[in-house]
Amino acid sequence: TQNKALPENVKYGIVLDAGSSHTSLYIYKWPAEKENDTGVVHQVEECRVKGPGISKFVQKVNEIGIYLTDCMERAREVIPRSQHQETPVYLGATAGMRLLRMESEELADRVLDVVERSLSNYPFDFQGARIITGQEEGAYGWITINYLLGKFSQKTRWFSIVPYETNNQETFGALDLGGASTQVTFVPQNQTIESPDNALQFRLYGKDYNVYTHSFLCYGKDQALWQKLAKDIQVASNEILRDPCFHPGYKKVVNVSDLYKTPCTKRFEMTLPFQQFEIQGIGNYQQCHQSILELFNTSYCPYSQCAFNGIFLPPLQGDFGAFSAFYFVMKFLNLTSEKVSQEKVTEMMKKFCAQPWEEIKTSYAGVKEKYLSEYCFSGTYILSLLLQGYHFTADSWEHIHFIGKIQGSDAGWTLGYMLNLTNMIPAEQPLSTPLSHSTYV
């Protein structure tokens, strides 16, 4: 008689990434009997929650339940009912909530309590919501990409299973760009990590890793833009801000109260003789780049070398995966190819920023104007951050791989977070076992 497949013995996990600009829900799946193996967990679903980040609900917490409904119902559909009660759900909030907590711990707590109340009312094994630290965000992003790239596996392979695999066990560095913060994480080459705050020690699958990480709060792309506007309006002669980071012909009115709402602009705050000002785009990459550089204080460094703002950064080492907004922005600009040099990227950005706004709107008719208008700034910011902030060069640019997904799973901190909380990354290398025959009878 023919062999008959038994029902698959799988497990599921859910992680919600509550970012500054939006929330995404990720569903992961893995074979139950292989949970200590490397590379067996994969993403089966991503659901982007409609609306802003949870920190924006501070004055309307009663709307949080409805906000989360669609994606939680989607999770209910994707995961078999028999698995619901065993499926852990985690919510990690990042820099948007770190900023809200800086403004008011009480308001941040209220938002998290109501988020928890909403998520607790689903039939999953909800494990709570918390604001993760910048260090965790960096570390879990690094774990995610190296787990997916097979870097923790001790088996050497003669074939490559993923596009970026160099077939050695050298880990990739992780570059993460969000709306409110950015993280850089990598294993430096025989270099002492001079600042203890930036040092992480891991033992994963029987190997020790000394990892450098830093999260730059307020240097995500959205908060960096607010910083730049707050800095530039200080020296504007009137309520018109001629801005090189926006396309020629672009116009937008900004409320001064919105500009100073975030803690990220406090250092530039001043009493202005107007309540609103108008951004008028002039579309000049070089000037935009110069304006962005003024956000990075490179005049002070108490270590052998720094990134910016006096933060220690060891010499860059190895390949890097650049994901989240690094990827989304560069993908939109069609600049993610391995073959595109840094010089070519700069040239393309110069051309893109100089294009008139009306032309841009016509060319990208399907893209929301709010997002479309900011790609010139975001692309220029990415170049400035990587080159002047983190000290990549034209030569080392080729070591940056702009990554959206690896093996079907999104690059980002959520997978690493779940692997850690479900104890699926053992400190020691598991004993290799023969292939299981339990799948067929």
Partner: antibody, heavy 119, light 107 residues
């Protein structure tokens, strides 16, 4: 194991303030919310309010102006205060633990404390 | 406020009978319904959450179903120890509300 124990006066005079303490064990108030529910003699259950793990509260609007819920995590205690009581407030008062972190359904209930409002 | 109604205030059955206790919500509550059992002089005991998920330790003869506005608690084979009042509760929106209860008696 999980336990909740309500303690408070058995008799309260009209217009006075009713104070009840719920002492919990077997779980931490930093990890779970606690709800208050009451049951008038021979009647059904009526939800009063909740205190969530970080301390934020939600109340039944029908009683909102009259009561407050607070807690002391270190003492494992939740406090319930109902002002300006009338005979209508005569009931068994229960505290109950959220089944999940902050859920609105309850897996463990206290034994309840019977409160009579009478002069 | 969402009203929860239980059509039978009392049900009389024999040991071994199958019983269905119904609960109706005045508006859509999804599957955000819990069921409790209360024996005389005791606090309520949790049986079911999310309309159909049984708590561990609750006998398998208890099951829940329904979504939207109509919900049922079924006891597949009533035992003498099941004599109690059964309450449904919605937690779809505040204020949380309970049904008036259905008293289960043994003939």
């Amino acid at each position: 194991q999980v336990q909740l124990l309500e303690s408070g006066p058995e008799l309260v005079k009209p217009s006075a303030t009713l104070s009840i303490t719920c002492t919990v064990s077997g779980f931490s108030l930093t990890n779970y919310g606690v709800h208050w529910i009451r049951q008038a003699p021979g009647k059904g259950l009526e939800w009063l309010g909740v205190i969530l793990r970080r301390g934020s509260t939600d109340y039944n609007a029908a009683f909102m102006s009259r009561f407050t819920i607070s807690k002391d995590n270190s003492k494992n205690q939740v406090y319930f205060k109902l002002r300006s009581v009338t005979a209508e407030d005569t009931a068994v008062y229960y505290c109950a633990k959220t089944a999940v972190v902050a859920g609105d359904y309850f897996d463990y209930w206290g034994q309840g404390t019977m409160v009579t409002v009478s002069s | 406020d969402i009203q929860m109604t239980q059509s039978h205030s009392t049900l009389s059955l024999s040991v071994g009978d199958r019983v269905t206790i119904t609960c109706k919500a005045s508006q859509n509550v999804g599957t955000n319904v819990a069921w409790y059992q209360q024996k005389p002089g005791q606090p309520p005991k949790a049986l079911i959450y999310s309309a159909s998920y049984r708590y561990s330790g609750v006998p398998s003869r208890f099951s829940g179903s329904g979504s939207g506005t109509d919900f049922t608690l079924t006891i597949s084979s009533v035992q003498a120890e099941d004599v109690a009042v059964y309450y449904c509760q919605q937690y779809n929106s505040y204020p949380l509300t309970f049904g008036p209860g259905t008293k289960l008696e043994i003939k």
